[in-house]
């Protein structure tokens, strides 16, 4: 068990993030140090607390999982939008209406799309049941009709008041998913209050003649306890990104310099010799220099290690569900002075590293963890929601540093 | 294709009704909606109610009282009716169909309250 | 019950940008749907924005609108104006009330 390896693992100087919490604070046990874990996760996701929910008893729709694992498999491909939810008909009680050869369906869907988020896409998913005789070659030909169904208040209570969202016509042979754009609904719903909405499918025949049977049937399969239930997937964009600016990093690393190496005569190099080649002199001086450091060098210093993340494991299988699990990494190993410029040390790492090489009571090292990090894509639960992310983003170490 | 004619008196005098008919082509008032807005001569747009395609009818407070609006599927019309016309009732009046927004109007018919 | 105030004319020179500007005067702009209506001289109304800032197939992408919730206003940028813009401007405002208010009207002269 890959991350309980955490637990036994030897509580080594700055071996890692694990020892320095276990060695500076004695009651901590890793129960206590996965919960906050686990907090601060949710709280990236805007959850509260895990689904209680078991991820055995939920049955994501076949398209959620079809996209994820086109997108996991796939490397090339993109979806058009790195969040991807799936709303199921919730409205599980109300019959379709058959009126003079039109049958009216209506759904009620629960969307809640946080206002930070950008709506690229939105469908509406139908199966549609075509019953008819084999013996007669043609399609159903129906006029299909979706509605968005209008909050009425006032004059007309009791009334459906509805805008035409998508009019054309459904020429079935087989049974199969057909999808609507409803893209300009789920925007008007994201600026409302609520949460509830309804929409509503009319299909009619195209002549004004009742249904026939003998010319077939077309239906929507609403049944609640069905693969084919109506679903309202929602494509949106997270508008909030950050950039950290470096050049002041930069310029600190290229005037990193050893008060120890002042009477060497090395000050004359700084704008001399490349940054690479000055690294390159001050290491061999320092390594020359210290036994311990050079020990620790060779197979300890700060680097990234192999962590396989194993959901079910940490309990988390019961609201992530796929992937079970992932190559997460992790950073490993001592931060000496000096800093190599492929760590990307900050200037406070810098200082602090400087000061614990003078006086290690004074200072601890400095820290070795991830500097950056990538995204995976995952399909979780969010309250009731199967919802997949194309870009999780920090849930991978890519490079370590010292901080 | 859709289109959206209204017809009625140019003239009406003051104190008297207004019958306006709205009659629509290529589209179906159990799926789209209707509205009739007005403009007077040279002045801006103003909504008057509008037809809901589930049957359900909206006013405009400013007129409740002396409008009706009804319609008959069956001959694609849909009616205005207004009673105690005034002077300042003179205006164009339009149908309009709703979808998801107006995307058709009728042409309008000029309606003069004068004796 | 609000209003919708729009500046009654606005002149502009061809090949500029102009912007129309619709203040709702209580209640909150973000709460209901914005239209905006063309109508030239003698002309029904056409359709330009509806929902705030989505345009109908058909009309040039020359034309935007915008919603600001700290002016409380609509906007209707035109780009790149050009000689048959030369009309009149209404706004309109859809809430789930279903009540539906138009503004004044801005009447823009091209020159």
């Known amino acids: 068990s890959p991350i309980m390896n955490l637990e036994q693992s030897p509580l080594e100087e700055d071996m890692s993030l694990f020892g320095d919490v276990f060695s500076e604070q004695d009651g901590v046990d890793f129960n206590t140090l996965l919960q906050s874990m686990k907090d601060e996760f949710l709280k990236t996701l805007n959850l509260s607390d895990i689904p209680t929910q078991d991820s055995a008893k939920v049955d994501p729709p076949e398209y959620m999982l079809e996209l994820y694992n086109k997108f996991a498999t796939d490397r090339t491909s993109m979806p058009s939008a790195n969040i991807i939810r799936s709303f199921k008909n919730e409205d599980l009680f109300s019959q379709p209406v058959s009126f003079n050869g039109l049958r009216k369906y209506p759904l009620l869907f629960n969307v809640s799309i946080p206002h930070h988020e950008e709506v690229i896409m939105a469908e509406l998913r139908l199966y549609t049941l075509v019953q008819r005789d084999r013996m007669i070659y043609d399609g159903v030909d129906r006029k299909i009709t979706i509605f968005e169904v209008l909050e009425s208040k006032g004059d007309n209570e009791g009334e459906r008041n509805m805008l035409v969202l998508v009019s054309g016509e459904i020429y079935g042979t087989n049974s199969e998913w057909e999808t609507f754009d409803v893209t300009d609904a789920i925007r008007r719903w994201q600026k409302s209050g609520s949460s509830t909405h309804q929409l509503e499918v009319h299909i009619e025949s195209k002549h004004d003649e009742a249904e026939d049977a003998s010319s077939g049937r077309l239906e929507i399969d609403t049944s609640a306890q069905n693969k084919h239930n109506p679903l309202l997937i929602v494509f949106s964009d997270d508008q909030s990104s950050d950039k950290e600016r470096k050049e002041e990093l930069n310029e600190m690393i290229s005037h990193e310099q050893l008060p120890e190496l002042d009477n060497l005569g090395l000050d004359s190099f700084s704008s001399g010799p490349g940054e690479e080649a000055l690294l390159q002199m001050r290491s061999n001086i320092i390594y020359d220099s210290t036994a311990r450091i050079r020990r620790n060098a060779k197979g300890n210093y700060c680097k990234r290690t192999p962590l396989y993340i194993d959901f079910k494991e940490i309990g988390w299988d019961s609201w992530i569900i796929a992937p079970p699990g992932y190559e997460a990494y992790e950073c490993r190993g001592v931060c000496n002075y000096p800093l190599a410029e492929h760590l990307t040390p900050t200037k406070h790492a810098i200082i602090q590293a400087l000061v614990h090489l003078k006086n290690s009571q004074k200072a601890s090292k400095a820290c070795c963890v991830p500097t950056k990090l990538e995204p995976i894509s995952i399909l979780y639960l969010d309250k009731g929601v199967v919802t997949y992310k194309f870009k999780y983003e920090g849930m991978a170490v890519s490079e370590c540093g010292c901080r | 294709q859709v289109q959206l004619q209204e017809s009625g008196p140019d003239l009406v005098q003051p104190s008297q009704t207004l019958d306006i008919t709205c009659t629509v082509s290529?589209?179906?008032?159990?799926?789209?909606?209707v509205h009739w807005v007005r403009q007077p001569p040279g002045k801006g747009l103003e909504w008057m109610g509008t037809?809901?395609?589930?049957?359900?009818?909206d006013y405009n407070s400013a007129f409740k009282d002396r409008l009706a609006i009804s319609r008959d599927t069956s001959k694609n019309q849909v009616s205005l009716k207004m009673d105690s016309l005034q002077t300042d009732d003179t205006a164009k009046y339009f149908c309009?169909?709703?979808?998801?927004?107006?995307?058709?109007w009728g042409q309008g018919i000029l309606v003069t309250v004068s004796s | 019950q609000f209003a919708l105030i729009q500046s009654d004319s606005m002149s502009t020179s061809a090949g500029s940008t102009v912007k129309l500007s619709c203040k709702r005067s209580?209640?909150?702009?973000?709460?209901?749907?914005v239209y905006w209506y063309q109508q030239h001289e003698g002309r029904s109304p056409t359709t330009m924005i509806y929902?705030?800032?989505?345009?109908p197939d058909g009309v040039p992408d020359r034309f935007s609108g915008s919603i600001d919730s700290s002016s409380n206003s609509a906007f209707l940028t035109i780009n790149d104006v050009q000689i048959e813009d030369e009309a009149v401007y209404f706004c309109?405002?859809?809430?789930?009330?279903?009540?539906?208010?138009f503004g004044g009207g801005t009447k823009l002269t091209v020159l």
């Open positions: 309109q405002s859809f809430s789930s009330g279903i009540k539906f208010i």
């Open positions: 209580t209640g909150n702009i973000g709460s209901s749907y």
């Open positions: 290529g589209f179906s008032l159990t799926t789209y909606n």
């Open positions: 309009a169909r709703l979808g998801y927004y107006v995307d058709y």
């Open positions: 929902d705030g800032d989505k345009r």
């Open positions: 037809m809901w395609n589930g049957g359900g009818i």
